[in-house]
């Protein structure tokens, strides 16, 4: 899988994980989250070549077509796979509001 | 839905379907494939500019950190969202064989 | 990291049998042909056969019918190739080596074990 | 069953180009993959479905397939080339796989 355990450990130029801190209010202008300040959000970058961790026939077909074609702008993106949510303390006047954000944290990759 | 009936009747620069017709034998190398010789592969491209068909609150939060941090490399990415299968004739020594290829032709897109 | 660890050397009588492991990690297993090539010293390579892991099924090379069974074992991810009624002549470095599973083995073997060599000799 | 034919030997001086042939009756309807095995190892895929190559082998490497022929270029040749290289195709008459020969390249000097 391209998680932490095999991204983080390998200097990956192909689809992989990639750290990425988030400041909510610094990188989102985000100032209604009181906690956490920010959080290990990650994300995916990275070349997907033939049969890199495709993620459907479609994208198998399409970076085969674009190792033959290279001049073609056609071709499959490294994107996130497994996400997981993040919990979060936020105010609606002075009642405290814990909450759960789904899908805020990707934990590993494809290529689709 | 970002599918043909929108992005192939309008000019758009975001994330959209796209046209893509794949020809076997000389796009893919494929030779094996009797019937069809080709087909409409179709494939998403196009820029994901803050709330434009997001997938997930990640996507969502990336687009809004891409906005704010335009220098930074994290960004969502245009990529397939329904897809269908074809159905290919292909012989085994004199015999032919019928099968669906699952997952094949791209119908919609997202941003991921 | 996407890899084929083969067992050790065997050394071997004319007669016997030898069993040769291929462990796969870093990869669907299910989701790629198996394929077994040999090389004779000084020789080329030589396919003997293929095993679809995900159901499988094999198909041999003809020299081989009836001397070579494939397996699998898909919770370990291993997969075997066992030669029987052994011959000098089958004396060879035994290669692993995978391929994407589509309808048909026509794609490349983008990824091979090490090698096992096996010796048969009295 | 299906037959692929390549020349034992190529030599080459560095620098310059080599040219390895793989000839079958109707070739050009078959996808070829090339491999190179270096002395003592394992093969290393260079060229699949006759003209794609994997990432991480240089653009020195190319290849072409028509009719009865495949051939692998190698361009401004190194040292680091000398090897065996082997053709390979699926041949769907017979669900067979099948490998050419092999041909020993030798960098000269």
């Known amino acids: 899988a391209l998680d932490a355990a095999y991204c983080f450990r390998n200097v990956q130029d192909n689809c992989c994980l990639r750290p990425l801190y988030i400041d909510f209010k610094r990188d989102l202008g985000w100032k209604w989250i009181h906690e956490p300040k920010g959080y290990n959000a990650n994300f995916c970058a990275g070349a997907c070549p033939y049969l890199w961790s495709s993620d459907t026939q479609h994208s198998r077909v399409l970076s085969l077509y674009n190792t033959i074609n290279p001049e073609a702008s056609a071709s499959p993106c490294c994107v996130s796979q497994d996400l997981e949510p993040l919990t979060i303390l936020y105010y609606i006047g002075k009642t405290p509001k814990i909450e759960q954000l789904s899908n805020m944290i990707v934990k590993s990759c494809k290529c689709s | 839905a970002l599918d043909a009936a929108y992005c192939f009747r309008n000019v758009q620069d975001n994330c959209c379907l796209r046209p893509l017709y794949i020809d076997f034998k000389r796009d893919l190398g494929w030779k094996w494939i009797h019937e069809p010789k080709g087909y409409n592969a179709n494939f998403c491209a196009g820029a994901c500019p803050y709330l434009w068909s997001s997938d997930t609150q990640h996507s969502r939060v990336l687009s809004l950190y891409n906005t704010i941090n335009p220098e930074a490399s994290a960004s969502p990415c245009c990529v397939s969202q329904d897809l269908e299968p074809l159905t290919i004739l292909y012989y085994i020594g004199k015999t032919p064989k019928i099968e669906q290829l699952s997952n094949m032709i791209v119908k919609s897109c997202k941003c991921s | 990291q996407v890899q084929l660890v083969q067992s050790g050397a065997e050394v071997k009588k004319p007669g016997a049998s030898v069993k040769v492991s291929c462990k796969a990690s870093?990869?669907?297993?299910?989701?790629?042909?198996m394929h077994w090539v040999r090389q004779a010293p000084g020789q080329g390579l030589e396919w003997m056969g293929w095993?679809?892991?995900?159901?499988?099924?094999?198909n041999y090379a003809q020299k081989f019918q009836g001397r070579v069974t494939m397996t699998r074992d898909t919770s370990i991810s291993t997969a075997y190739m066992e030669l029987s009624r052994l011959r000098s002549d089958d004396t060879a470095v035994y290669y692993c080596a995978r391929s994407f599973l589509w309808l048909v083995p026509s794609d490349a073997f983008d990824i091979w074990g090490q090698g096992t060599m096996v010796t048969v000799s009295s | 069953s299906y037959v692929l034919t390549q020349p034992p030997s190529v030599s080459v001086a560095p620098g310059k180009t080599a040219r390895i042939t793989c000839g079958g009756n109707n070739i050009g309807f078959r996808s070829v993959h090339w491999y190179q095995q270096k002395s003592g190892q394992a093969p290393v895929l260079v060229i699949y479905f006759d003209r794609a190559r994997p990432s991480g082998i240089p653009e020195r490497f190319s290849a072409s397939n028509s009719e009865n022929t495949a051939t692998l270029t190698i361009r401004r040749v190194e040292a680091g080339d000398e090897a065996d290289y082997y053709c390979q195709v699926w041949d769907s008459d017979s669900d067979d796989l099948v490998f050419g020969g092999g041909t020993q390249l030798t960098v000269l000097g």
């Open positions: 095993i679809n892991p995900n159901t499988g099924g094999t």
């Open positions: 870093g990869y669907t297993f299910t989701g790629y042909y």
